[in-house]
C-alpha cells in the first residue's frame, strides 16, 4: 500500500514509497521537505502561505544557517522550516492511527538539522529503521539555531527563543495534519537528544504545547541543565551587536539593527570555544533558550504541573561528560598526559562558581575521595568524566525525574542509563558511553548499515528502538508490537529505578538509585551552601575582538582561586559533536 | 475574470449515483485545486473533497471516502464530482469551489448544483 | 476533525449596530476565513487569514483572533448585511462553523 499524495493544510504533497524488500509487500512513505512555518531574522515563526499544485517532497531542505565545524564559515540556509516524514505501510490497506513520534536533534542550540551528519547519503536521522520496526511515523524537521535561533536582549525588544518556537510550530503542525498521512494526532511522542533532548523537556514545559504532546523522550539533556537556559541574554546580545556595528545602549535599537543585519554574519559573530578556557566549555554556550515569561514563562523547575499528563522516559549515557570533559581538561583522553589535582579543582570550582570557595572545597572533597586509595591516572580520568557527567547531565536528570513524577496525575515516568560503550578506537580502554553514542542505536544504524556494526550492537538497537516505539505506542516501554528483552519498571521516588541499557539486557538490568551518594551530595549538601555571587552567568566582554571567547567575570565577590597555568596541549571540539 | 459554471439540478434515486461538472475559466484551470462542498436544505457548509487539476491528486473527507470520486478534464478545463449510493440525506446543493491563493479560503465559488435523491 | 463552534447562532440588530460573531476552534489552527451567504446563493469570502479583506469587500467588516479563538465584526450594520456568515477552518480536513444567522430587529 502507499500514500500517493497527501492533502494538507497548505497543498497537496507527494514524496516517494520505498519498498522493504524485492518481493514488494512492506514499504514505506518518504516526505522530505514540507515546509511547517516561515520566519524572518529574529522574529517568532509565522504559519506557511502553502501552494497551489503537488508539492514533490522528495528531498531534504538545507539546514538552517548555521557555523561550519570550523566556525569561519557559514552554511544552510535562513528558510529552513521544513520537515521530514516517514510511515511505514503494510501490503493492502494504508497504515491508520499510528503513533507519532517526532525528533528534535540536538547541537548546542548551535547546530544541527532534522536529517542529521550525512555520510554517502547515509543520513543520521533518517527515520526508517523506526518507523518501519516499530510500526510508527517519525517526524524530523529543522529549527533555526545559533544567534538567529536564540538571540535575545531579556525584553520585548528581542525576546528569544525563536528556535523553541520553530520547535513548537512542527509540533503543532503535525498535530493538525499528521492524521492525512494515516498518523494518530492524539498520540504524539516527542523525543530529542542533548539540546534536543532540553528542548522536549522545554516543550512539554511550555503551556503553549498544552494538549499537543502525549509523551516525551529526553536523551541526555533536561530543561534544569546547566546549559539549557541563558540566565544573562543581554550581555550577550551586546557582544554580537559590537562585532556587526549595532548600537548597545538601547535595546529597541540594537534589535532593529540586528534585525537588518546579514544573517551571515550574525552567525559568525559567535564562536564557541574549542580549546580550554578560564571556564568550562559550556558556560560558553551564548546562545540557547531564555526564560521569557512567555513561551518559558518561569524558571523551568516551576513549571511541572504542565508535564502531569505527558507521560516521560529520561536518561543519560554513562559517560556523557566524556566530550565536554575532553575540552576542559584536555588530558583527560591523552595517556602520555596527566591530569592533577589542579586541573580538577580548577574545573570543579568553574561548575561551582555560584557557591564560591566553600562550594569549590566541598564538591573536590567528595568526588576525590577515591584518590588517597587508587590514585591512579585512570581512576583521576574517570573522576574528571564522572563529574562533568554528573554536573551536566546526571542530576538534571534525576531532579526532573522527581519533578515529573511527583507532579504527575496520568503520567508514567521511566529511567534509563546508556552504558554501551564507545566504538571510538582512539578513546581510553576505560570509555563507556560517551555523549551522543546513543543516537546511532536509536537510529537503528547497526541494521542500515550493518557491516560496520557488530551482533551485540544490533542487540542495543534493536531493544531500544522497541523500548522506544513501545513506549510511543502505549505509554509503556513494555507494551506494544515489538518484544523486549526484559521488563522496565517504572521510576519511583523512593527507589530511583532505571535501566541499564548494555548488550545484555536481562532483568538484572533494572537498577535503582544511581550515583545515590553524589545526586544527595549535589540535591542537599551543595544546595544548601550560601551563594556568593548574583549571578554566576555573567561573563564580560572580550577586550579584543579576534577573542574568541569572553574574559571570566571580575566581580570582586568572585572566590574562584585560579590554579597554576596548564601548558598541556588543547583539544579541539570533535567533528561529531552531539550536544 | 474566473467564472465556475456548474451543471443543472439532478434528480436521482437511492443507490444510483450522480455526475456534477464545474467548468473553469478566467485563469489557469492547472494553478488552483477545486474543492466540492455540499449544503443540505436548511443546513451548513460540509466540505466533500478536493482534487489538484494539474496532475489529478485528490483528497477526500473520511465521511465520503469509497462513494465519491472527483475527477477532471483538463481540455475542456472542467472537474467533476461524482457521488455514488446516494441516499435521502444526500439531498443538497452541491459546489465547486476554487481557492483564493496559496493555501487559502475557497475565494470563488459555483452557483451551486441542487441534488434530490428521492424514491 | 476539528470542531468550528460558532456563537450565537442567530443573532437580531438594527442598521447601524456594531455586530461581532465569535467562532471558537477546538484546537489551535492556522488558517481562519469568514464567508457571507445569502438565501439562493453561493457563499462569498469575507475574510482571509483571519483578518485579511477579501478583494471587494467593504472595511467595515474586520477579523481577528488567533490560536483557537477568533472574532468577525462589522463595524456599522448596512441592509445588505443581513444573512448567514459561516467561519472555516483549513487543514487536511477543513471545516465550516455551524453558521450565524444575522436578521433585521
Known amino acids: 500500500a502507499k500514500l500517493g499524495a497527501v492533502y494538507t493544510e497548505g497543498g497537496f504533497v507527494e514524496g516517494v514509497n520505498k519498498k522493504l524488500s524485492l518481493l514488494g509487500g512492506d514499504s514505506v512513505d518518504i516526505f522530505k521537505g514540507i515546509p511547517f512555518a516561515t520566519a524572518k531574522t529574529l522574529e517568532n515563526p509565522q504559519r506557511h502561505p502553502g501552494w497551489q499544485g503537488t508539492l514533490k517532497a522528495t528531498n531534504f531542505k538545507k539546514r538552517c544557517l548555521q557555523a561550519t565545524i570550523t566556525q569561519d564559515n557559514t552554511y544552510g540556509q535562513e528558510d529552513c522550516l521544513y520537515l521530514n516524514i516517514w510511515v511505514p505501510q503494510g501490503r493492502k490497506q494504508v497504515s491508520h492511527n499510528l503513533p507519532v513520534m517526532v525528533w528534535i536533534y540536538g547541537g548546542a542550540f548551535l547546530m544541527g538539522s532534522g536529517q542529521g551528519a550525512n555520510f554517502l547519503k547515509n543520513y543520521l536521522y533518517d527515520g526508517e529503521e523506526i518507523a518501519t520496526r516499530g510500526n510508527v511515523i517519525v517526524v524530523t524537521f529543522n529549527y533555526r539555531v545559533g544567534p538567529l535561533g536564540f538571540l535575545s536582549t531579556g525584553d520585548a525588544n528581542l525576546p528569544g527563543n525563536f528556535g523553541l518556537r520553530d520547535q513548537h510550530m512542527a509540533i503543532a503542525w503535525v498535530k493538525r495534519n499528521i492524521a492525512a498521512f494515516g498518523g494518530d494526532p492524539d498520540n504524539i511522542t516527542i523525543f530529542g537528544e542533548s539540546a534536543g533532548a532540553a528542548s522536549v523537556s522545554l516543550q512539554t514545559l511550555s503551556p503553549y504545547n498544552k494538549g499537543l504532546i502525549r509523551r516525551a523522550i529526553s536523551q541526555s539533556g533536561m530543561a534544569l541543565s546547566p546549559w539549557a537556559i541563558q540566565k544573562n541574554p543581554l550581555f550577550w546580545a551586546k557582544t554580537i551587536a559590537k562585532k556587526v556595528g549595532c548600537p548597545t545602549e538601547d535595546t529597541g535599537k540594537m534589535a532593529a539593527c540586528l534585525k537588518i543585519t546579514d544573517p551571515r554574519a550574525l552567525t559568525l559573530a559567535y564562536k564557541l570555544p574549542v580549546k580550554k578556557q578560564e571556564y568550562p566549555v559550556v558556560h560558553y554556550l551564548a546562545f540557547i533558550p531564555v526564560i521569557d515569561g512567555d513561551f518559558i514563562p518561569d524558571d523551568p523547575i516551576n513549571l511541572y504541573n504542565n508535564t502531569a499528563d505527558i507521560d516521560y522516559i529520561a536518561g543519560i549515557n554513562n559517560m556523557d561528560g566524556h566530550l565536554f570533559a575532553t575540552i576542559d581538561v584536555p588530558a583527560v583522553d591523552k595517556t602520555k598526559q596527566t591530569v592533577t589535582e589542579e586541573d580538577f579543582y580548577r574545573l570543579v570550582s568553574g561548575h561551582t562558581v555560584a557557591k564560591g570557595l566553600k562550594g569549590a572545597q566541598a564538591t573536590f572533597d567528595i568526588y576525590t575521595e577515591s584518590w588517597a586509595q587508587d590514585p591512579s591516572q585512570e581512576n583521576m580520568k574517570k573522576t574528571v568524566v564522572a563529574f562533568e557527567t554528573d554536573v551536566l547531565f546526571l542530576i538534571p536528570t534525576e531532579i526532573a525525574l522527581a519533578q515529573h513524577k511527583a507532579h504527575a496525575k496520568s503520567a508514567k515516568t521511566y529511567s534509563y542509563l546508556f552504558s554501551h560503550p564507545s566504538r571510538m578506537p582512539i578513546y581510553p580502554k576505560w570509555m563507556g558511553a560517551d555523549h551522543a553514542d546513543d543516537l546511532q542505536y536509536v537510529f537503528g544504524k547497526p541494521f542500515a548499515t550493518p557491516l560496520g556494526y557488530r551482533p551485540q550492537d544490533r542487540a542495543v538497537s534493536k531493544a531500544m528502538i522497541a523500548y522506544w516505539t513501545n513506549f510511543a505506542r502505549s505509554g509503556d516501554p513494555n507494551m506494544g508490537n515489538s518484544p523486549v528483552p526484559t521488563h522496565w519498571y517504572p521510576y519511583t521516588l523512593e527507589n530511583g529505578n532505571y535501566l541499564d541499557i548494555t548488550k545484555t539486557i536481562t532483568s538484572a538490568s533494572m537498577k535503582e538509585h544511581l550515583r545515590e551518594k553524589f545526586l544527595k551530595f549535589w540535591a542537599v549538601t551543595f544546595e544548601v551552601l550560601p551563594t556568593v555571587t548574583g549571578d554566576q552567568d555573567t561573563l564580560t566582554p572580550p577586550e579584543d575582538d579576534s577573542e574568541v571567547a569572553p574574559d571570566p567575570p571580575s566581580d570582586d565577590s568572585q572566590v574562584v582561586p585560579v590554579p597554576p597555568t596548564d601548558d598541556s596541549v588543547e583539544a579541539q571540539m570533535p567533528a561529531t559533536i552531539g550536544f | 475574470q474566473v467564472q465556475l459554471v456548474q451543471s443543472g439540478a439532478e434528480v436521482k434515486k437511492p443507490g444510483a449515483s450522480v455526475k456534477v461538472s464545474c467548468k473553469a475559466s478566467g485563469y489557469t484551470f492547472t494553478s488552483y485545486n477545486m474543492h466540492w462542498v455540499r449544503q443540505a436544505p436548511g443546513q451548513g457548509l460540509e466540505w466533500m473533497g478536493v482534487i489538484n487539476p494539474g496532475d489529478g491528486a485528490t483528497s477526500y473527507n473520511q465521511k465520503f471516502k469509497g462513494r465519491v470520486t472527483m475527477t477532471r478534464d483538463t481540455s475542456t478545463s472542467t472537474v467533476y464530482m461524482e457521488l455514488s449510493s446516494l441516499r435521502s440525506e444526500d439531498t443538497a446543493v452541491y459546489y465547486c469551489?476554487?481557492?483564493?491563493?496559496?493555501?487559502?479560503?475557497?475565494?470563488?465559488w459555483g452557483q451551486g448544483t441542487l441534488v434530490t435523491v428521492s424514491s | 476533525d476539528i470542531q468550528m463552534t460558532q456563537s450565537p447562532s442567530s443573532l437580531s440588530a438594527s442598521v447601524g449596530d456594531r455586530v461581532t460573531i465569535t467562532c471558537s476552534a477546538s484546537q489551535s489552527i492556522s488558517y481562519m476565513n469568514w464567508y457571507q451567504q445569502k438565501p439562493g446563493k453561493a457563499p462569498k469570502l469575507l475574510i482571509y487569514d483571519a483578518s485579511s479583506l477579501a478583494s471587494g469587500v467593504p472595511s467595515r467588516f474586520s477579523g481577528s483572533g488567533s490560536g483557537t479563538d477568533f472574532t468577525l465584526t462589522i463595524s456599522s450594520l448596512q441592509p445588505e448585511d443581513f444573512a448567514t456568515y459561516y467561519c472555516h477552518q483549513r487543514s487536511s480536513t477543513p471545516t465550516f462553523g455551524q453558521g450565524t444567522k444575522l436578521e433585521i430587529k
Open positions: 469551489a476554487r481557492d483564493y491563493y496559496g493555501s487559502s479560503p475557497l475565494g470563488y
